[in-house]
């Protein structure tokens, strides 16, 4: 991680934390993430089919950044959502969301990021995902597009 | 800090934390930061020549905001990076990055911010820095441009 | 919270945390917030007339997101501030701020977010608020506009 081996585990219980980075073979929603290589972290939380799976109820800070870019700006509306799904509840719950409209000059090469981050009370078995409106406009560089959380 | 004296140190070990604010005498990259006056925090982490120096291996939430503005928009590409350097490794590692292109109307006065924040596994002696593409377009007000971290 | 009951309180002291969401009956500054329903969290911190009131001195990560949108862009300057007030001190202190100018195409429907987040040393009885420049341009959906903090 970040160019050097992980530190030895601390004596106290393992910190529940994740930092996943963009994976360019995402073909549909929710976004898929790199969970193994590069500056990735995954400890005390599982990754499954695009989602972070909570295994201990508690308070978590959840964050995501998505980097949108294009070559000939058409100002298609962009949205970036972090949402939660739990088998006990019928519907996805949107936790955080960012929207952009009219953000660049028609025809120009353009680039823009959306950042979300906040504290939530999560329950064991909650699945967290990231959704975007225009997959083809997302750039998946590990430093630009990411999704993470940590237990407070 | 924030208009009143620091609280007495807590019994438990000092929290490793930093919040540095914009310093307008930055002349080159990486950006330099105010580490003494105003709403600054620096505890258990060192500040050296623009960088935050980690002295204890572990998990850290790292964040930065940069406020760009100009009198007459010409849509110069803007980038804002948080990167890491360690003497053991030959190359800088970009941890987080934001880019903007085609973000304002040509000729107009404009203003825009870039925010970055995520969790990383850092090792003692890592140096963290912030880089921007257009130094002349950065405004260094303490509430607008900052760089910080805390150990989880 | 988030569609399921809060977890039973942990044995250790209650975590000081807040996540408040947009309240559309805000009529003036500072913004008012939903502190009861939906994905709201409020524990070990009080909410009073738009403000989060600190009752224990220490280090806090404070964040806010505001979602601005309009039907017909006229590029009114937008600002989003998190500020602090304490009866011992005469003046509000701006902790974090975001500004936007020249951000959309004249006459077009537009949407944009501002995100702020950083660590501060807060003292018991500090009151934290959020201010925006153009209240009529704020959308108060709970996933889009929020204000929170947690004690490190």
């Amino acid at each position: 991680q970040i160019g050097h081996p992980s530190p030895p585990p601390e004596k106290k219980e393992l910190r529940k934390v994740a930092h996943l980075t963009g994976k360019s073979n995402s073909r549909s929603m929710p976004l898929e993430w790199e969970d193994t290589y590069g500056i990735v972290l995954l400890s005390g939380v599982k990754y499954k089919k695009g989602g972070l799976v909570i295994n201990e109820t508690g308070l978590y800070f959840v964050y995501s950044k998505v980097y949108f870019r294009g070559q000939s700006c058409n100002n298609l509306p962009l949205s970036h959502k972090v949402y939660m799904r739990n088998s006990k509840y019928p519907q996805d719950l949107v936790m955080m969301e960012g929207k952009m409209m009219s953000y660049c000059t028609t025809g120009q090469m353009w680039a823009r990021s959306s950042y979300l981050g906040a504290v939530f009370n999560l329950t064991s078995a909650d699945h967290l995902y990231v959704n975007v409106s225009e997959l083809s406009l997302v750039n998946f560089e590990e430093s630009q597009t990411f999704f993470g959380l940590y237990k407070l | 800090q924030i208009g009143h004296p620091s609280p007495p140190p807590e019994k438990k070990e000092l929290r490793k934390v930093a919040h540095l604010t914009g310093k307008s005498n930055s002349r080159s990259m990486p950006l330099e930061w105010e580490d003494t006056y105003g709403i600054v925090l620096l505890s258990g982490v060192k500040y050296k020549k623009g960088g935050l120096v980690i002295n204890e291996t572990g998990l850290y939430f790292v964040y930065s905001k940069v406020y760009f503005r100009g009198q007459s928009c010409n849509n110069l590409p803007l980038s804002h990076k948080v990167y890491m350097r360690n003497s053991k490794y030959p190359q800088d590692l970009v941890m987080m990055e934001g880019k903007m292109m085609s973000y304002c109307t040509t000729g107009q006065m404009w203003a825009r911010s870039s925010y970055l924040g995520a969790v990383f596994n850092l090792t003692s002696a890592d140096h963290l820095y912030v880089n921007v593409s257009e130094l002349s377009l950065v405004n260094f007000e303490e509430s607008q441009t900052f760089f910080g971290l805390y150990k989880l | 919270q988030i569609g399921h009951p809060s977890p039973p309180p942990e044995k250790k002291e209650l975590r000081k945390v807040a996540h408040l969401t947009g309240k559309s009956n805000s009529r003036s500054m500072p913004l008012e917030w939903e502190d009861t329903y939906g994905i709201v969290l409020l524990s070990g911190v009080k909410y009073k007339k738009g403000g989060l009131v600190i009752n224990e001195t220490g280090l806090y990560f404070v964040y806010s997101k505001v979602y601005f949108r309009g039907q017909s862009c006229n590029n009114l300057p937008l600002s989003h501030k998190v500020y602090m007030r304490n009866s011992k001190y005469p003046q509000d202190l701006v902790m974090m701020e975001g500004k936007m100018m020249s951000y959309c195409t004249t006459g077009q429907m537009w949407a944009r977010s501002s995100y702020l987040g950083a660590v501060f040393n807060l003292t018991s009885a500090d009151h934290l608020y959020v201010n925006v420049s153009e209240l009529s341009l704020v959308n108060f959906e709970e996933s889009q506009t929020f204000f929170g903090l947690y004690k490190l």
Epitope: Q71, C73, N75, L76, T106, M109, L137 | - | -
Partner: antibody, heavy 119, light 111 residues
Amino acid sequence: QVQLVQSGAEVKKPGASVKVSCKASGYTFTDYTIHWVRQAPGQCLEWIGVISTYQGDASYNQKFKGRATMTVDKSTSTAYMELSSLRSEDTAVYYCARFPDWDYAMDYWGQGTLVTVSS
Amino acid sequence: EIVMTQSPATLSVSPGERATLSCKASQSVDYDGDSYMNWYQQKPGQPPRLLIYAASNLESGIPARFSGSGSGTEFTLTISSLQSEDFAVYYCQHSRELPYTFGCGTKLEIK
């Protein structure tokens, strides 16, 4: 399949205006910008401008600003380019082309519309 | 604006031989690791057809004998073994910024 079908040839007098249409089919019209390019006989290709099919606003080559007007009709998936104050040097074949925002180039072109300006 | 200069104006090559076409930009068309240079083929009475995008990427459906190279200001289109259907006019175009500009073309004719 993707098609951009342009309106037929036009003959105009100097000082008049011409409006060329470009009807798109086989894809989601509002997902791509439409660019207009012209080619005078034996001359280079010349970029006129681009319109957002989603938002309806346009960016023009400075050379054509004030004379060219681009519009779209989302309901019929049609883009239009009107050129006013025509002169003999505007005699050219006018092309529309779509440009995917996520790509690098104009990937599909209309068949072209010959506009002849002659007194 | 960026001026595109193509050379030669006309190139005479025999079928089966290799053709190399050049395009120079008045300033760099690179940004962030990509070269915003495209190549089109045009035959009489037809619209241009995209061959190569981003300097070296082959558009789908285009034969592998076409290839592009270069970066910054100097770019090349190569046709490894000319077929009869390849004799046409070839245009380079940048998409780095507005206004987009085209070269004035290289006419590839049968020797």
